[in-house]
């Protein structure tokens, strides 16, 4: 009675192919003959799963990085099969947005390029999609703006698709810096105020970064000694009647408003004294 190790040991994948990340994979350890009988099986990589009592291994929720597996059928000796590649297919991984240009902060009018990177994908054939607020913008790995505008600011994501699924980057905030614009002078309680009351002029603007310095001017283009967003006239006098405008400044530049006219009229008391 000649004793010998198990012969022609093979690791067989029972699943239909391809195997996808998250699948349950069943493998069997087959052999041709053995003397004495096979009493146990071993699986590599060792310690990755509990050793099954039978020559069948079930891998629950298989990972994208599970590469090769080998089994051994053992009697007094162990015979190892050649490793089999699971070849697990998975959606693209580690998708991220990278700004290619400009290298520094983005100013209105700049040419801007964003790149969609990912670390790996199987299968390798992928499609790219760029999205802002749920809307598809482009289908290339790069998203290009010839001349960026403040309206282009916002949250962008890039998506990479393969036949298994799609993966998104984290939201990427595109911030556009621009000089104060859309300046206007608003007047409270209105543009017609009775003398003796108070009038507040507010310099409203749209800017990024926000306006850091305001300058007020009168109808003679004389700068007034006020540098906050609000110009309060109290008590307001008839002599304050006229057109006013404001200028806003931030680190990018300056902007100015059109003229707004304030009319101050006499009170009944003043008219009665005349």
């Amino acid at each position: 009675d000649v004793q010998y190790p198990p012969k022609k040991v093979t690791t067989v994948i029972q699943n239909p192919m391809p195997i996808r990340e998250g699948d349950t994979v069943t493998l069997s350890c087959n052999y041709n003959s053995s003397n004495p009988s096979v009493t146990r099986y071993e699986w590599k990589p060792h310690g990755a799963w509990e050793e099954p009592s039978l020559g069948v291994l079930k891998i629950q929720n298989v990972g994208w990085d599970n590469t090769t597996i080998a089994c051994a059928a053992c009697n007094s000796w162990c015979s190892w099969a050649s490793p089999v590649a699971l070849n697990v297919q998975y959606a693209p991984r580690d998708v991220r947005v990278r700004k290619i240009k400009p290298l520094s902060e983005i100013h209105s009018g700049n040419s801007v390029s964003l790149q969609c990177d990912f670390s790996s994908s199987h299968p390798k054939e992928v499609q790219f999609f760029w999205e802002k607020n749920g809307r598809l913008l482009g289908k290339e790995s790069q998203l290009n703006f010839d001349s960026i505008s403040p309206e282009d600011a916002g949250s962008y994501s890039c998506w990479v698709n393969n036949s298994i699924g799609q993966t998104a980057s984290k939201a990427w905030t595109l911030e556009v810096l621009y000089a104060p614009r859309r300046l206007r002078v608003s007047m409270s309680p209105g543009d017609q105020v009775m003398e003796g009351k108070s009038a507040t002029l507010t310099c409203e603007s749209d800017a990024n970064p926000p306006v850091s310095h305001y300058t007020w001017f009168d109808w003679n283009n004389q700068s007034l000694p006020y540098h906050s967003q609000k110009l309060r006239l109290e008590p307001v006098k008839v002599q304050h009647s006229g057109a006013y405008w404001c200028q806003g400044t931030n680190s990018v530049g300056k902007g100015r408003s059109p003229l707004s006219t304030l009319t101050v009229y006499y009170s009944p008391e003043t008219i009665g004294r005349r």
């Epitope: 809307r135 598809l136 916002g154 998506w159 799609q166 939201a171």
Partner: antibody, heavy 113, light 107 residues
Framework: EVQLQQSGPVLVKPGASVKMSCKAS????????MNWVKQSHGKSLEWIGI????????SYNQKFKGKATLTVDKSSSTAYMELNSLTSEDSAVYYC??????WGQGTSVTVSS | DVQITQSPSYLAASPGETITINCRTS??????LAWYQEKPGKTNKLLIY???TLQSGIPSRFSGSGSGTDFTLTISSLEPEDFAMYYC?????????FGGGTKLEIK
């Protein structure tokens, strides 16, 4: 006006499957992603997954992988979600949402024997 | 996944008052937080996204602030139609996750 019209309420037996629809109008369907969200009775919202209406590419919350399948039919501007192997845990209202800005009215699913 | 803790879960207030609702995330989400209003018989309404951007058509009495992990929704001068359920949601990464909700009721 953007509108997402979802299919009506359903009562199904445990173990069965259900396929609900979300018909979009008022915008170019393939220009936007479609999300699906679950709301169990008296509970908060859970994101199920998202589908690219142009490519059909999908991404799922790990919790709903194997439970939900998202598809689109561009010709009818309709998104679909199929739920399989239903249990009482799947009883909920399911919403489709274009990004975050427009939501359907919800489809109520009741699983009961 | 990003966890979100929303507080309070219940709030009673009177018309004209100003209220705040808070959301805290388990990790930094930059400024990518949205706020919704939910009312029976109506579709969910997006109020604010990216932390502080007011969605088109939403009254200016709604405002959002915060970045990183702490965010606040403020409703100033409450109107009768503002009494509803409010949810926050992070849109920094998938899977999107939601806060547990705040029920705003009339005192």
């Amino acid at each position: 006006e953007v509108q997402l019209q979802q299919s009506g309420p359903v009562l199904v037996k445990p173990g069965a499957s259900v396929k609900m629809s979300c018909k979009a109008s008022g915008y170019t369907f393939s220009d936007y992603f479609m999300n699906w969200v679950k709301q169990s009775h008296g509970k908060s919202l859970e994101w199920i997954g998202i589908i690219n209406s142009y490519s059909g590419g999908t991404s799922y919350n790990q919790k709903f992988k194997g439970k939900a399948t998202l598809t689109v039919d561009k010709s009818s501007s309709t998104a679909y979600m199929e739920l399989n192997s239903l249990t009482s845990e799947d009883s909920a209202v399911y919403y489709c949402a274009r990004w975050m800005d427009y939501w359907g009215q919800g489809t109520s699913v009741t699983v009961s024997s | 996944d990003v966890q979100i803790t929303q507080s309070p879960s219940y709030l009673a207030a009177s018309p004209g008052e100003t209220i705040t609702i808070n959301c805290r995330t388990s990790e930094s989400i930059s400024k990518h937080l949205a706020w919704y209003q939910e009312k029976p018989g109506k579709t969910n309404k997006l109020l604010i996204y990216s932390g502080s951007t007011l969605q088109s058509g939403i009254p200016s009495r709604f405002s959002g602030s915060g970045s990183g992990t702490d965010f606040t929704l403020t409703i100033s001068s409450l109107e009768p139609e503002d009494f509803a359920m409010y949810y926050c949601q992070q849109h920094n990464e998938y899977p999107w996750t939601f806060g547990g909700g705040t029920k705003l009721e009339i005192k």
